[in-house]
C-alpha cells in the first residue's frame, strides 16, 4: 500500500478519509489503528459499530472518531482538537474474523497554528454550548508518500 | 438461483499441467470472494486459498502457495485453479465455494458450493 | 494456523437420537465457526454460522452452540437424511482450516 499524507493545523480538527471497494469489503466493520514503529503492530485506536448495519453512527474514542458510509465505500475518521502527538503512521483497516485488511495506509502530519502567536484578543473561541465541530470546519490537506519518502525515521 | 458449475473430471500424468474451472451464475459474480477447498480421498476438507474476482485479490493457505495458481476471469463469470506440474499426491475432489459474510458476524462462510471436480494423476 | 479438533470420529446412533458432536479450536476464535454436512459423493452444505445461526432451510433440529475454543452442533431427533459427515470450520482467520470430520451411521 501506497502512504497517503493528511496534514492538518494543531488545535484543528482533522478528516482522514479512506475510500474501499463497498461490495469486497460488505458486512465487514471497520477500525482505525495507529502504527507503533515501523514494523510495529498497529495499535487499535477506534472501531465503528459492533452491528455493522449501524456502522453509519459515529462512535469516538476520546477525540478520535470514526464513521463508515458502506454504501458509498468511504470510512471518514475525524481527529478532534488535533496535537503534535497525534501526528504519525496509521491504518484504516477492514475486519474479518480477527483479521484485518489494510484499506489505507496514513500519515498524519501536524502543522503549527498560524494564528497561535497573535494576542488572544484577536481569537475567537466557541461557547461552551456550542459544538467543536461546528466551530471548526473540518479540512485536509493530503498527499501520497513520493517514491523513496518513509514515514518513519530511519533507525540506528 | 445461486449455482457454481465446475468443470469435468480430469486425469493426468505426473508432470503435466491443468487448469479447473468453476463458474458462478446467479448472483454478482465479481462481488463474491470464491474459496478452493481440496478433499483427499476419504478424508477431510483443505482450504487451498480465495479470491475476490472483482480485482483478483487473492490468499492462498501456506500449505498450498506456490503449488497452485488461483485466478478469475470477471468478464466470464469463471474462477479457476491451476497446476504447473502435477503430482500422484494431487490426486482429490476439488470444490469451488462462494464465501459469503454475514453482516452481523463479519466473517465468512462459505454457502454455495460446487459438484466438485475429481482430479486423478496417474503415471 | 488455527486446529479444529471434532470428536468423536464416528458416532452410531438411531432415528429418533438425540447426537452432540463438539469441535474444539486450538486458539480462541470468538463465535467465528460453522458446521457444514457432507453427504457421499457430493459437496459440503453450510449448516450453521457464527456458530449458533442456522442456515435458511435447514431443520430447527439442528442447533449449534459455544465461543472461544469449544463448541457443539446437536442434532434433536435424528432423521434418516442426517446420517452423513458433519464437518466444523474456523473463520477467525486465514488459511480457514476445518475439522477432520465426524461419521453419522445408523446403528
Known amino acids: 500500500h501506497n502512504t497517503t499524507v493528511f496534514q492538518g493545523v494543531a488545535g484543528q480538527s482533522l478528516q482522514v478519509s479512506c475510500p474501499y471497494d463497498s461490495m469486497k469489503h460488505w458486512g465487514r466493520r471497520k477500525a482505525w489503528c495507529r502504527q507503533l514503529g515501523e514494523k510495529g503492530p498497529c495499535q487499535r485506536v477506534v472501531s465503528t459499530h459492533n452491528l455493522w448495519l449501524l456502522s453509519f453512527l459515529r462512535r469516538w474514542n476520546g477525540s478520535t472518531a470514526i464513521t463508515d458510509d458502506t454504501l458509498g465505500g468511504t470510512l471518514t475518521i475525524t481527529l478532534r482538537n488535533l496535537q503534535p502527538h497525534d501526528a504519525g503512521l496509521y491504518q484504516c483497516q477492514s475486519l474479518h474474523g480477527s483479521e484485518a485488511d489494510t484499506l489505507r495506509k496514513v500519515l498524519v502530519e501536524v502543522l503549527a497554528d498560524p494564528l497561535d502567536h497573535r494576542d488572544a484578543g484577536d481569537l475567537w473561541f466557541p461557547g461552551e454550548s456550542e459544538s467543536f465541530e461546528d466551530a471548526h470546519v473540518e479540512h485536509s490537506i493530503s498527499r501520497s508518500l513520493l517514491e523513496g519518502e518513509i514515514p518513519f525515521p530511519p533507525t540506528s | 438461483e445461486v449455482q457454481l458449475v465446475q468443470s469435468g473430471a480430469e486425469v493426468k500424468k505426473p508432470g503435466e499441467s491443468l487448469k479447473i474451472s468453476c463458474k458462478g451464475s446467479?448472483?454478482?459474480?465479481?462481488?463474491?470472494?470464491i474459496a478452493w477447498v481440496r478433499q483427499m480421498p476419504g478424508k477431510g476438507l483443505e482450504w487451498m486459498g480465495i479470491?475476490?474476482?472483482?480485482?483478483?485479490?487473492?490468499r492462498y493457505s501456506p500449505s498450498f502457495q506456490g503449488q497452485v495458481t488461483i485466478s478469475a476471469d470477471k468478464s466470464i463469470s469463471t474462477a479457476y485453479l491451476q497446476w504447473s506440474s502435477l503430482k500422484a499426491s494431487d490426486t482429490a475432489m476439488y470444490f469451488c465455494?462462494?464465501?459469503?459474510?454475514?453482516?452481523?458476524?463479519?466473517?465468512?462462510?462459505?454457502?454455495?458450493w460446487g459438484q466438485g471436480t475429481l482430479v486423478t494423476v496417474s503415471s | 494456523d488455527i486446529q479444529m479438533t471434532q470428536s468423536p470420529s464416528s458416532v452410531s446412533a438411531s432415528v429418533g437420537d438425540r447426537v452432540t458432536i463438539t469441535c474444539r479450536a486450538s486458539?480462541?476464535?470468538?463465535?467465528?465457526l460453522a458446521w457444514y454436512q457432507q453427504k457421499p459423493g457430493k459437496a459440503p452444505k453450510l449448516l450453521i454460522y457464527a456458530a449458533s445461526s442456522l442456515t435458511n432451510g435447514v431443520p430447527s433440529r439442528f442447533s449449534g452452540s459455544g465461543s472461544g475454543t469449544d463448541f457443539t452442533l446437536t442434532i434433536s431427533s435424528l432423521q434418516p437424511e442426517d446420517f452423513a459427515t458433519y464437518f466444523c470450520?474456523?473463520?477467525?482467520?486465514?488459511?480457514?482450516?476445518f475439522g477432520q470430520g465426524t461419521k453419522l451411521e445408523i446403528k
Open positions: 479470491i475476490y474476482p472483482g480485482d483478483s485479490d487473492t
Open positions: 446467479g448472483y454478482s459474480f465479481t462481488s463474491s470472494w
Open positions: 486458539q480462541g476464535i470468538s463465535s467465528w
Open positions: 465455494a462462494r464465501s459469503r459474510t454475514f453482516y452481523y458476524d463479519s466473517s465468512d462462510y462459505f454457502d454455495y
Open positions: 470450520q474456523q473463520a477467525d482467520s486465514y488459511p480457514r482450516t
